[in-house]
């Protein structure tokens, strides 16, 4: 095998990786909260909005104590992939009224993409199971009207906010177990 190589190149320790993932998730949560508030200011929401294609909320805060690391990361990755797809769809098909949310919506998409990559790297470093992704969902139908696009935006940002809030709590709890 030849001589031993020199000191290997340094990359982040999984615990440091988890720390930076928490920071990134918090930052994304703040972005989402701000964007949701911006949307409410421009287009006040008349009650709660939901979208059947969005993932159901992963877990109540009270159930966090029983979490296992693989389950949290796998579920979080799957849910965030779904939200990424919905944000992409919103930017593409949301209509002219939602153009007022740019460039913030584009920034949100880029940060969501970055968080997903960070989660996957963390799972690889820990050698946690990364199950095959769900089969591709059917394409999302364009909103039926401009107001339909706005309602969808309320639902997507609201759901993402709840998911990220759960994610921060879950990741902080998991940090104590690593």
């Amino acid at each position: 095998p030849g001589p031993p190589p020199g000191p290997p190149r340094v990359s982040p320790d999984p615990r440091a990786e988890l720390d930076s993932t928490v920071l990134l998730t918090r930052s994304l949560l703040a972005d989402t909260r701000q964007l949701a508030a911006q949307l409410r200011d421009k287009f006040p929401a008349d009650g709660d909005h939901n979208l059947d294609s969005l993932p159901t909320l992963a877990m109540s805060a009270g159930a966090l104590g029983a979490l296992q690391l693989p389950g949290v990361l796998t579920r979080l990755r799957a849910d965030l992939l779904s939200y990424l797809r919905h944000v992409q769809w919103l930017r593409r098909a949301g209509g002219s009224s939602l153009k007022t949310l740019e460039p913030e919506l584009g920034t949100l998409q880029a940060r969501l993409d970055r968080l997903l990559r960070r989660l996957q790297l963390l799972m690889s470093r820990l050698a946690l199971p990364q199950p095959p992704p769900d089969p591709p969902a059917p394409p999302l139908a364009p909103p039926s009207s401009a107001w339909g696009g706005i309602r969808a935006a309320h639902a997507i940002l609201g759901g993402l906010h709840l998911t990220l809030d759960w994610a921060v709590r879950g990741l902080l709890l998991l940090k104590t177990r690593l």
Epitope: P14, R15, L81, Q120, L121, S124, R125, L126, P129
Partner: antibody
Amino acid sequence: EVQLLESGGGLVQPGGSLRLSCAASGFTFSSYGMHWVRQAPGKGLEWVAVISYDGSYKYYADSVKGRFTISRDNSKNTLYLQMNSLRAEDTAVYYCAAGVPDYWGQGTLVTVSS
Amino acid sequence: QSVLTQPPSASGTPGQRVTISCSGSSSNIGSYYDVHWYQQLPGTAPKLLIYSNEERPSGVPDRFSGSKSGTSASLAISGLRSEDEADYYCAAWDPSLYGPVFGGGTKLTVL
């Protein structure tokens, strides 16, 4: 400085067994998933097995499933590979690697021949 | 036959820019799984060169860069040097294996 030091390689007859060890230092061993990767003479890299940071998940390449067992002892910072029913095609340099893999040992040669 | 396909060889002259491709499928690289690149100098163990498609571990010169698009990835080496002569491997997570899969490797020759 990160170090991964493999040992236990050598010449073994077909059907025989060997146990490889990998001693880790210079990083938090218990926070990393660990792999065994092999390289047959003049060939490319082939992933063999992986074990999660806490030892609760283990996965194997189809070519070694049922014959090789990966394990770890976090209290000793050591990774193991128990190889049974060895075949000529298992002849390779075996590397232990940590993380993505981010860090690699220098390898230990396993030769299966009669 | 590797699940990830790389050209067996590549070459360039000192100072040149060389690109090595790595082609996968919708079940690995195309399924949001990151690509990592390794350099194996003659007679030594592999070393991580690029992780998460484009991130460089500390100590890796910025002459090395990575990118990913769709189901393929590429490694670019600019300002080629004689010491870059080595085998280069791409790797990605393969969900059917529950482990990483490596490309067949590309032997880079500096002319």
